[in-house]
């Protein structure tokens, strides 16, 4: 029998420091541009080399970014949202949203050492 | 992933014009971001114009703004660089360039580390 594969959903508040070369991190979603069936949220879609993002570490490809400065990005065209990144300033506070796929086991199955039973 | 192929460089008098078209093969083309780099004999691959997944935003190097034109066709999944009032300095090989999603840094930034998927290119020689 086959496991189910589940999802673990983080909150997390990420600060970034506008590099020299910026942010350094691509999105994709919006309102006109649904990347996710059913959800114009915006998402990262990719994370630059040696950029702000990465050498800070924990904003991830697949993070659903709920937030800007406190701004939601709810119901936003996708060129708003990109605007609205790139006019954040030089200390960038981001809500984000991690989805962590979780495999459980099969159904049934009890793992070595399980206390019960 | 994308594949590209850019087609109508060739040899131009100074002054002249010069239409660039790149072909993407792949799904999903109005979510990437498309831009143009240039790279002369001896030097870096640099920025010259970018185009957002809808087409509705532009940026360029300061050195081709006002004769330079990038627009896209997402119905024909393709990208254009009309390069007019051509000058010898505008001379090199012509990449077009594609990656997911939009940079949230201004193209005063851009470099080709911004960019996963490339051309071949295609050679523009102004005499």
């Known amino acids: 029998m086959n496991g189910r594969v589940d999802y673990l959903v983080t909150e997390e508040e990420i600060n970034l420091t506008r590099g020299p070369s910026g942010l350094g991190f691509n999105i994709v979603g919006g309102t006109d541009q649904q990347y996710v069936s059913n959800d114009s949220g915006i998402y990262v879609s990719r994370i630059k080399e040696n950029g702000a993002a990465a050498l800070d570490g924990r904003l991830q490809e697949g993070d659903k970014i709920l937030s800007v400065n406190g701004q939601d990005l709810k119901n936003l065209l996708h060129q708003d949202a990109v605007d609205l990144f790139r006019n954040a300033g030089y200390a960038v506070s981001l809500r984000v949203q991690h989805r962590l796929q979780v495999q459980n086991g099969p159904i049934g199955h009890r793992g070595e050492g399980d206390p019960s039973g | 992933d994308v594949q590209l192929v850019e087609s109508g460089g060739g040899l131009v008098q100074a002054g002249g014009s010069l239409r660039l078209s790149c072909a993407a093969s792949?799904?999903?083309?109005?979510?990437?971001?498309m831009g143009w780099f240039h790279q002369a004999p001896g030097k870096e691959r640099e920025f010259v114009a970018e185009?957002?997944?809808?087409?509705?935003?532009?940026g360029y190097t300061d050195s081709v703004k006002g004769r330079f034109t990038i627009s896209r066709d997402n119905a024909k999944n393709t990208v254009y660089l009309q390069m007019n009032s051509l000058k010898p300095e505008d001379t090199a090989v012509y990449y077009c360039?594609?990656?997911?999603?939009?940079?949230?840094?201004?193209?005063?930034?851009?470099?080709?580390?911004?960019?996963?998927?490339w051309g071949q290119g295609t050679q523009v020689t102004v005499s």
């Open positions: 360039a594609a990656v997911i999603g939009s940079p949230t840094d201004s193209t005063d930034y851009r470099s080709s580390l911004d960019y996963d998927y």
């Open positions: 185009i957002s997944g809808t087409g509705g935003n532009t």
């Open positions: 792949g799904r999903a083309f109005s979510s990437y971001t």
